[in-house]
C-alpha cells in the first residue's frame, strides 16, 4: 500500500539504484517515486553531513522484501516513494530554495525583477528543467537579478551548493503550467533525427510518447512498430532531443511513428501510467512473481498491488490453466519497459497502475460564511481541492467554498445550505482559479446528496460541517484533485504553515472576489480562542486562526472551504472556514470545524453511502 | 497502393453457412493485424474479429463467438472469415481492415461484400 | 464493453458552416479514439487518428480534439463532399466499439 511517513535521522543501509543530488527530501521522493525501481530513499540534508560530495544527496533504493534496515543519522531523513499512492503522485514541484545554487548546464542567462519571474521564464523554454536566481542582494553587482536557466543529463543538478542571496527552483512544467503549448499530433511513417536520450520497448507510440513526456530529457520521439522491416528493432521507441528543442529534420520512413513530450501542454498531462492491455501479446522481463488468477484485469491489479511489479503478462495457453484461473507473470525490468515484446501469443499484457493518479474512488486520508482579507491572489493548481458551491435561481452567484476530498465526494459548512437544502439549484466548479472564467459552457458537477451533520442546528456554530456527493465522479488532474484528511483525533501534530483559501469578500462590507485568494494564517490555541469569544463556547471540535492584530482572515463566501496545513511536505486539512466576529478584526480569529473531530463521522459517511469502503490510507 | 477486396458474399437460409474472404495487395501482408467490421443496412459499424500477423491469436466480438472463425494464408495474401449457424441478424456489409500499426483503428478498408440471411 | 456516444445524430449544414461533432466514451480511453466518413454504398475512410492528427490525404479544415471520455470532430468550413455520415471509434480494448454515427445532411 502507500506509505507517507518520514524518518527523521535515519539513513537506509543498501539498496541503492540511483543517486542525484535534490533540495529537499520531497523532491529526492518525488524523484523515487518516478524511478522504476525506487522503493526507498535516503537524503542527506546540507546539515547533516561535512562531506561537500554527499551534501543534498539523494539515495534511491530498490528491496525485495520492500524495506531495508535503517541506521541512525542525525538530519538525514528517508521515506518512501508514493508509487500506489493515487492522486499523491505529481511530478510537479513549485518549492522555491533560498541561499541554494542549483548547479547544471547554464544555457540562458537574462535579467529579471524577482525569482518567480526567473521560473516563469523557465517553465516557458522547451528546455530548462531547473533554475537560479541572485537576487539584489547578491554580494558581486554584475550578476543580481540574473536568472540562469539549466539543464543536466538527468534533470536534476550536477550539483547544489549553500550560497547567499541566490535562489533556485524547477520548472513548472510538470505542473501543466508552461506556456509554450504542445504538439498533440503524432505523425506515421515519419522519423525524427537528432540524438537519442533512451530507448525502451513499447506496445505502441502512446505508451512511447507517455514514456517521453516523464523523461527528464525527451523533447520528441520516434517508434518503430511491430510491422517494422527489422524484426529486432520492432516496438523500439527512441527518446529524442536536439540543441533547438525540436527535430532538427525528419524522414519520410514506412512503419514508424513520431511526435511529441506532452510535458509542455496547458492545463492536462497525460497519466504517468499506462491502464490499456494488450491482448495477444506476451510482455519479457525479469521474473518477480507466478499467480493463479481470474482474468486478466485481477492479473493487472495484483501486478499493481505488488510495489514492485512493472509489467506483467496472463496466459490463456490451456497447460497455464486450471479451471477458471489461468498464471499471471509478474514481471521487472531495469528500465520499468518490457525487455522483449511478442505479437500473437496466447497471452495478454499490460503495466502496473502503480503511477497512475487517479487512484481508487475514495476520499483521502493519512494514518500517524466566506475573499479572504488580507491575502493574495493564488496561481494555478496551487490549490487543487478547493471548489466553488454557486446557487443557480434566477441569476447564478457564488456562496461557498469547499474542499475536494475524494472522487465524489466534497467537505463543506453545513451553514452554507441554510434556507438552500435543495441540491437540484447548486452547481460545483472545480479546477477553476478565476470565476469570470465560468461561462454557460463550464463543466460542472451536481449534487446527488447533502448530508448535513445530524447535530447541526441553523444560526448554531456547532458541528458546522457537511458532507457532498457528487452525481458523478471527477477525473483527478493538476488542477483538480483532492486534499487528504487528518488522522481521528489529530492533537500531536504542531502544524505552524497553514492557509485559508477562498473567493469571499476582501472586507468586511465588500463583494466576492473573481480571483481565488489564499492567505497564510497560524493557529490559535482554544484556550486563546475561548478568551476573544467569551459569549460562545469554542469547543474541542473547533479550531482557531488569526492574527493577533487582525488584519488577515476569511470573510463572507469562503464558508465551507479548507483551512490546509502543510506538515512533512504533505497538505491536510485540518479546519472548514465556519465563523467569525466580523472578518480580519483585532483579536477576533476565525472559527473553524476542526476536521480531525469528524473522522468517524466522515467515513461512515462516505461509505455507508456506497455500501462499500471509500478510505484510501495513504500511510 | 494498399489494396483490399473482398468476396464471397451472398444470399444464404438461416443457419446456412458463408466463407468470406479479402485478398491483399500493396503492403507485406504478413506483417499486419487484421480485422473483419460489418454494418447491417441503414445501421452503423459493428467489429467483428480481428486476426494477428502470424495467425497466432484471433478475437471475436459475443455476437458472433462460437459461430465465425477467422483465419489468413499469409503466403496467399489472403485473410478468411467462415461463418456458421448463420442468422437473419448477421445481415451486413463485410468489410475487411488493416490494422492502424502502433495506433490502433483501421486505416485501409475494402469495398465490402453484402451477406444476406434470409429463408 | 466501452459504450461511444456521439451526437448529434444528424445535423444540418450549409456550405462553410462551421460543423461540430461530440463523442464521450464510457470509461477513460486517453487518445486511442479515430474518427472515419461513410459516404453512401462506400466503406468507410479513415479521418482522424489518436484524437487529433490528421491522416494523410485528408484536407485540413478536418481537426480533431479530446483526450480521456470527450472528444470532438470539427470541419471548419463545410464543402459539397462532406455531406456524410461520420463515426467516431475507440481502440483501447476489444471489443472495438464505434459511436452511432452522425449523418450530416445540406440544410
Known amino acids: 500500500g502507500c506509505l507517507t511517513q518520514l524518518y527523521e535521522n535515519a539513513f537506509f543501509r543498501g539498496g541503492d539504484v540511483a543517486s542525484m543530488y535534490t533540495p529537499n527530501a520531497q523532491y529526492c521522493q518525488m524523484r523515487c517515486t518516478f524511478h522504476p525501481r525506487c522503493l526507498l530513499f535516503s537524503f542527506l540534508p546540507a546539515s547533516s553531513i561535512n562531506d561537500m560530495e554527499k551534501r543534498f544527496g539523494c539515495f534511491l533504493k530498490d528491496s525485495v522484501t520492500g524495506t531495508l534496515p535503517k541506521v541512525h543519522r542525525t538530519g538525514a531523513v528517508s521515506g518512501h516513494s508514493l508509487k500506489q499512492c493515487g492522486h499523491q503522485i505529481s511530478a510537479c514541484h513549485r518549492d522555491i530554495y533560498k541561499g541554494v545554487d542549483m548547479r547544471g548546464v547554464n544555457f540562458n542567462v537574462s535579467k529579471v525583477s524577482s525569482v518567480e519571474e526567473c521560473q516563469k521564464r523557465c517553465t516557458s523554454n522547451i528546455r530548462c528543467q531547473f533554475f537560479s536566481y541572485a537576487t539584489q542582494t547578491f554580494h558581486k553587482a554584475e550578476y543580481r537579478n540574473n536568472c540562469l536557466l539549466k539543464y543536466s543529463p538527468g534533470g536534476t543538478p550536477t550539483a547544489i551548493k549553500v550560497l547567499s542571496n541566490v535562489e533556485s527552483g524547477f520548472s513548472l512544467k510538470p505542473c501543466a503550467l508552461s506556456e509554450i503549448g504542445c504538439h498533440m499530433n503524432i505523425f506515421q511513417h515519419l522519423a525524427f533525427s537528432d540524438v537519442d536520450v533512451a530507448r525502451v520497448l513499447t506496445p505502441d507510440a502512446f505508451v512511447c510518447r507517455t514514456i517521453c513526456t516523464y523523461h527528464p530529457n525527451c523533447l520528441f520521439f520516434t517508434f518503430y512498430t511491430n510491422v517494422w522491416k527489422i524484426e529486432s528493432q520492432r516496438n523500439v521507441c527512441l527518446l529524442k532531443t536536439s540543441e533547438s528543442g525540436t527535430p532538427s529534420s525528419s524522414t519520410p520512413q514506412e512503419n514508424t511513428i513520431s511526435g511529441y513530450s506532452l510535458l509542455t501542454c496547458k492545463r492536462t498531462l497525460p497519466e504517468p501510467c499506462h491502464s490499456k492491455i494488450y491482448p495477444g501479446v506476451d510482455f519479457g522481463g525479469e521474473e518477480l512473481n507466478v499467480t493463479f488468477v481470474k482474468g486478466v484485469n485481477v492479473c493487472q491489479e495484483t501486478c499493481t498491488k505488488m510495489i514492485r511489479c512493472q509489467f506483467f503478462t496472463y496466459s490463456l495457453l490451456p497447460e497455464d490453466c486450471k479451471e477458471e484461473k489461468c498464471k499471471c507473470f509478474l514481471r521487472l525490468s531495469m528500465d520499468g519497459s518490457p525487455t522483449r515484446i511478442a505479437y500473437g501469443t496466447q497471452g495478454s499484457s499490460g503495466y502496473s497502475l502503480r503511477l497512475c493518479n487517479t487512484g481508487d474512488n475514495s476520499v483521502c486520508t493519512t494514518k500517524t460564511s466566506t475573499r479572504i482579507v488580507g491575502g493574495t491572489n493564488s496561481s494555478w493548481g496551487e490549490w487543487p481541492w478547493q471548489v466553488s458551491l454557486q446557487v443557480k435561481l434566477t441569476a447564478q452567484r457564488h456562496l461557498c467554498g469547499g474542499s475536494l476530498i475524494g472522487h465524489q465526494w466534497v467537505l463543506t459548512a453545513a451553514h452554507c445550505f441554510d434556507g438552500l437544502p435543495l441540491q437540484d439549484v447548486w452547481r460545483i466548479y472545480s479546477g477553476i482559479l478565476n470565476l469570470s472564467d465560468i461561462t454557460k459552457d463550464t463543466p460542472f458537477s451536481q449534487i446527488k446528496e447533502i448530508i448535513i451533520h445530524q447535530n447541526y442546528k441553523v444560526s448554531e456554530g456547532n458541528h458546522d460541517i457537511a458532507l457532498i456527493k457528487l452525481q458523478a465522479p471527477l477525473n483527478y488532474t493538476e488542477f483538480q484533485k483532492p486534499i487528504c484528511l487528518p488522522s481521528k483525533g489529530d492533537t500531536s501534530t504542531i502544524y505552524t504553515n497553514c492557509w485559508v483559501t477562498g473567493w469571499g469578500f476582501s472586507k468586511e462590507k465588500g463583494e466576492i472576489q473573481n480571483i481565488l485568494q489564499k492567505v497564510n494564517i497560524p493557529l490559535v490555541t482554544n484556550e486563546e480562542c475561548q478568551k476573544r469569544y467569551q459569549d460562545y463556547k469554542i469547543t474541542q471540535r473547533m479550531v482557531c486562526a488569526g492574527y493577533k492584530e487582525g488584519g488577515k482572515d476569511a470573510c463572507k463566501g469562503d464558508s465551507g472551504g479548507p483551512l490546509v496545513c502543510k506538515h512533512n511536505g504533505m497538505w491536510r486539512l485540518v479546519g472548514i472556514t465556519s465563523w467569525g466576529e466580523g472578518c480580519a478584526r483585532r483579536e477576533q480569529p476565525g472559527v473553524y470545524t476542526k476536521v480531525a473531530e469528524y473522522m468517524d463521522w466522515i467515513l461512515e459517511k462516505t461509505q455507508s453511502s456506497d455500501g462499500k469502503a471509500q478510505m484510501q490510507s495513504p500511510a | 497502393e494498399v489494396q483490399l477486396l473482398e468476396s464471397g458474399g451472398g444470399l444464404v437460409q438461416p443457419g446456412g453457412s458463408l466463407r468470406l474472404s479479402c485478398a491483399a495487395s500493396?503492403?507485406?501482408?504478413?506483417?499486419?493485424i487484421m480485422w473483419w467490421v460489418r454494418q447491417a443496412p441503414g445501421k452503423g459499424l459493428e467489429w467483428v474479429s480481428g486476426i494477428y500477423s502470424s495467425g497466432g491469436y484471433t478475437q471475436y466480438a459475443d455476437s458472433v463467438k462460437g459461430r465465425f472463425t477467422i483465419s489468413r494464408d499469409n503466403s496467399k495474401n489472403t485473410l478468411y472469415l467462415q461463418m456458421n449457424s448463420l442468422r437473419a441478424e448477421d445481415t451486413a456489409m463485410y468489410y475487411c481492415a488493416r490494422e492502424l500499426e502502433g495506433l490502433g483503428g483501421f486505416d485501409y478498408w475494402g469495398q465490402g461484400t453484402l451477406v444476406t440471411v434470409s429463408s | 464493453d466501452i459504450q461511444m456516444t456521439q451526437s448529434p445524430s444528424s445535423l444540418s449544414a450549409s456550405v462553410g458552416d462551421r460543423v461540430t461533432i461530440t463523442c464521450r466514451a464510457s470509461q477513460s480511453i486517453s487518445s486511442y479514439l479515430n474518427w472515419y466518413q461513410q459516404k453512401p454504398g462506400k466503406a468507410p475512410k479513415l479521418l482522424i487518428y489518436?484524437?487529433?492528427s490528421l491522416q494523410s490525404g485528408v484536407p485540413s479544415r478536418f481537426s480533431g480534439s479530446g483526450s480521456g471520455t470527450d472528444f470532438t470532430l470539427t470541419i471548419s468550413s463545410l464543402q459539397p463532399e462532406d455531406f456524410a455520415t461520420y463515426y467516431c471509434?475507440?481502440?483501447?480494448?476489444?471489443?472495438?466499439?464505434f459511436g452511432g454515427g452522425t449523418k450530416v445532411e445540406i440544410k
Open positions: 489518436a484524437a487529433s
Open positions: 471509434q475507440q481502440s483501447y480494448s476489444t471489443p472495438l466499439t
Open positions: 500493396g503492403f507485406t501482408f504478413s506483417r499486419y
